[in-house]
């Protein structure tokens, strides 16, 4: 058993049918010695008397808020949550496995640049009685500070008979050095509590591996005289690291017909313009990627040929 925060305790339960459970001793936070009784949640049933209460925690029915009283007065509370292990594996029931980029991916994180700011998100199908707490650091043995805000509900989606809730959090490395080579990974730890269930989730990454630039901005077409060709131009996204001479992007330009089945023409360039043939009813799209490190491509920025 360990303390999550003041008066909130997590009981680690290795559960299997007929498991003996965990013996927990609760102590009433009072100088009083006599006439103390204990109850659980809203029940008036007296579970025991005395300054300490010993309970056997076998299941969620044994968790909850234990209160010690004397003469009708509340002396102190202890909220017991369960962190359940089955077959040697801690439960991961609160968050959905996003399965991208691999199985057992519960937290996903992205950064728009090298400033040390990043966003993580996760999915759940639970709509109520749910709280998250996020901590982060660079490295774990001698951790350097990363400050995270509060997790917020960022999206709701209905997919068939599933309703999904997306939560996200923004974090900022306290002393980020954008140009430095990373040697220690960022660690992100999420505590999730649903009712009386506690779970924790972690992710470890280098900023360079989670970079995903914003799409190029100000995408424009300029027709070339007496030609089906157009000059496409664009700019670096505002959110990308500067100077651009050091933090350089490469670009992919794509001409896509109205039908998804039509052949796509693609051009790769390090410049912020390209000349392509604009077919009728086609659209031109441009996306960006770090020029020197193969992290994610941005989403596409698009304009119609017409």
């Amino acid at each position: 058993i360990w303390e999550l925060k003041k008066d909130v305790y997590v009981v680690e339960l290795d559960w299997y049918p007929d498991a003996p459970g965990e013996m927990v001793v609760l102590t009433c936070d009072t100088p009083e010695e006599d006439g103390i009784t204990w109850t659980l949640d809203q029940s008036s049933e007296v579970l025991g008397s005395g300054k300490t209460l010993t309970i056997q925690v076998k299941e969620f029915g044994d968790a909850g808020q234990y209160t010690c009283h004397k003469g009708g007065e509340v002396l102190s509370h202890s909220l017991l949550l369960l962190h359940k292990k089955e077959d040697g594996i801690w439960s991961t029931d609160i968050l959905k496995d996003q399965k991208e980029p691999k199985n057992k991916t519960f937290l996903r994180c992205e950064a728009k640049n090298y400033s040390g700011r990043f966003t993580c998100w996760w999915l759940t199908t639970i709509s109520t009685d749910l709280t998250f707490s996020v901590k982060s650091s660079r490295g774990s043995s001698d951790p350097q500070g990363v400050t995270c805000g509060a997790a917020t509900l960022s999206a709701e989606r209905v997919r068939g008979d599933n309703k999904e809730y997306e939560y996200s959090v923004e974090c900022q490395e306290d002393s980020a050095c954008p140009a430095a080579e990373e040697s220690l990974p960022i660690e992100v730890m999420v505590d999730a509590v649903h009712k009386l269930k506690y779970e924790n989730y972690t992710s470890s990454f280098f900023i360079r591996d989670i970079i995903k630039p914003d799409p190029p901005k100000n995408l424009q077409l300029k027709p070339l005289k007496n030609s089906r060709q157009v000059e496409v131009s664009w700019e670096y996204p505002d959110t990308w690291s500067t100077p651009h001479s050091y933090f350089s992007l490469t670009f992919c330009v794509q001409v896509q017909g109205k039908s998804k089945r039509e052949k796509k023409d693609r051009v790769f360039t390090d410049k912020t313009s390209a000349t392509v043939i604009c077919r009728k009813n086609a659209s031109i799209s441009v996306r960006a990627q770090d020029r020197y490190y193969s992290s994610s491509w941005s989403e596409w920025a698009s304009v119609p040929c017409s």
Partner: nanobody
Framework: EVQLVESGGGVVQAGESLRLSCAAS????????MGWFRQAPGTEREFAAA????????YYADSVKGRFTISRDNAKNTVYLQMSSLKPEDTAVYYC????????????????WGQGTQVTVSS
């Protein structure tokens, strides 16, 4: 958000078997842990059995252990309670429940309840 409909109750002789079904509908029903409770006249609702959302783990009250089997078919969104070697003291209204805390034998750890199906075991 989740609807539960029990079926399969009836009148049987002691020693016989019965299978109860609980059809679940609504959002995210596959993510719920499911339980069966029962209530005899003049008594509190009592836990019988529970199964986790994956269907990989089950939990039983001592009074039904070895006689009752809980199972689920997530393709059909249905939970079953196979009851064998029934005794007169198994007579009760049987309720299906859905929640997110497994294992729990406490009724208020379940969020959704069916209307119940009557099981009568005569001697």
């Amino acid at each position: 958000e989740v609807q539960l409909v029990e079926s399969g109750g009836g009148v049987v002789q002691a020693g016989e078997s019965l299978r109860l079904s609980c059809a679940a509908s609504g959002y995210n029903v596959k993510d719920y842990e499911m339980g069966w409770f029962r209530q005899a006249p003049g008594t509190e609702r009592e836990f019988a059995a529970a199964i986790n959302w994956r269907g990989s783990s089950t939990y039983y009250a001592d009074s039904v252990k070895g006689r009752f089997t809980i199972s689920r078919d997530n393709a059909k969104n249905t939970v079953y309670l196979q009851m064998s070697s029934l005794k007169p003291e198994d007579t009760a209204v049987y309720y299906c429940a859905a929640g997110r805390l497994y294992p729990s034998s406490r009724s208020r750890d379940y969020d959704y309840w069916g209307q119940g199906t009557q099981v009568t075991v005569s001697s």
